[in-house]
Interface confidence: low
């Protein structure tokens, strides 16, 4: 068990703070909830603290919760491939470029680390080149979320990881908006981290609303499990 992994044996409170600017539309989001890495479970509620969110909530899911991939469930035989927990408590910087097909792009930078007993994900997001009447600024996405695989590989040069995946957002007319994600994670501290073999995270996300919440918000339930690396040969013959 890595030193960082010991911090995730129980339920951990989570705080998410985002400052965003998409085509000049500025906004802030606060989120809070908890994560349980034993089950790969995240429960979070996000509130747009500046009024109405200028982009659809589903376009921010990867920035919020795929930001705290330290809550992914890594099976026993894969624990030596869990970069995310091994970087804690000092944490990691997570940078992404997200290309929305035939539309604009988000660039994000986040610091994910422990502050006391709370896991904090602080994000800055800049979006450019979006069409004002496109699927994103035109709010044409359905309020739901598909399952995805998130592919992880080591980046030995930077003592971190590279991550690639493609999100499929459902559009109200029945078509799909693709969002290509290019992600890099580097540790904040200079302690040892686990550099993984290639594998993937399998994600299931459910979006809902709080009937008592008047502000623009999103409630998120998510399960994330690591996969893609088989047991070693010695395991097969036990």
């Amino acid at each position: 068990m890595s030193k960082g992994e010991e911090l995730f044996t129980g339920v951990v409170p989570i705080l998410v703070e985002l400052d965003g600017d998409v085509n000049g539309h500025k906004f802030s989001v606060s989120g809070e909830g908890e994560g349980d890495a034993t089950y790969g479970k995240l429960t979070l509620k996000f509130i747009c603290t500046t009024g109405k969110l200028p982009v659809p909530w589903p376009t921010l899911v990867t920035t919020f919760s795929y930001g705290v991939q330290c809550f992914s469930r890594y099976p026993d035989h894969m624990k030596q491939h869990d970069f995310f927990k091994s970087a804690m408590p000092e944490g990691y910087v997570q940078e992404r470029t997200i290309f929305f097909k035939d539309d604009g792009n988000y660039k994000t930078r986040a610091e994910v680390k422990f502050e006391g007993d709370t896991l904090v994900n602080r994000i800055e997001l800049k979006g450019i080149d979006f069409k004002e009447d496109g699927n994103i600024l035109g709010h044409k996405l359905e309020y739901n979320y598909n399952s995805h695989n998130v592919y992880i590989m080591a980046d030995k040069q930077k003592n971190g990881i590279k991550v690639n995946f493609k999100i499929r957002h459902n559009i109200e007319d029945g078509s799909v908006q693709l969002a290509d994600h290019y992600q890099q994670n580097t540790p904040i501290g200079d302690g040892p981290v686990l550099l993984p073999d290639n594998h993937y995270l399998s994600t299931q996300s459910a979006l809902s609303k709080d009937p008592n919440e008047k502000r623009d918000h999103m409630v998120l339930l998510e399960f994330v499990t690591a996969a893609g690396i088989t047991h070693g040969m010695d395991e097969l013959y036990k």
């Epitope: 409170p13 703070e17 400052d19 802030s28 606060s30 603290t49 502050e115 904090v120 602080r122």
Partner: nanobody, 126 residues
Framework: QVQLVESGGGLVQAGGSLRLSCAAS????????MGWFRQAPGKERDFVAG????????YYADSAKGRFTISRDNAKNTVYLQMDSLKPEDTAVYYC???????????????????WGQGTQVTVSS
């Protein structure tokens, strides 16, 4: 702008307790963190305790750990500092401060805060 008004200061004997309150008004939705600082005569303004507005996670100066507790009531837009086992060296003017959103993690320096109250005097007699 965010306006901050402190209350609850006063004179107390060593070993006693006080509870300070800081009521925030204005654009409180833009607040990321709030903190308490104190300034004794002729000394720098020192960090005491801080709290994140959204999740309520807390952080403390070493001198406050185990004796002081910071908390918040979001519905009332108020932050509290419960001070127990007070010592004469705790005598100071106590200031409430608010920080706008930004990237500083667990802000503890005075220049990391954007809004300040007028302060409330705490005197601990021996």
């Amino acid at each position: 702008q965010v306006q901050l008004v402190e209350s609850g200061g006063g004179l107390v004997q060593a070993g006693g307790s006080l509870r300070l309150s800081c009521a925030a008004s204005g654009r409180t939705f833009s607040t990321a963190a709030m903190g308490w600082f104190r300034q004794a005569p002729g000394k720098e303004r020192d960090f005491v305790a801080g709290i994140y507005w959204a999740a309520g996670s807390t952080y403390y100066a070493d001198s406050a750990k185990g004796r002081f507790t910071i908390s918040r009531d979001n519905a009332k837009n108020t932050v509290y500092l419960q001070m127990d086992s007070l010592k004469p060296e705790d005598t100071a003017v106590y200031y409430c401060a608010a920080r706008r959103r930004g990237f500083t993690l667990a802000p503890t320096r005075a220049n990391e805060y954007d809004y300040w109250g007028q302060g409330t005097q705490v005197t601990v007699s021996s």
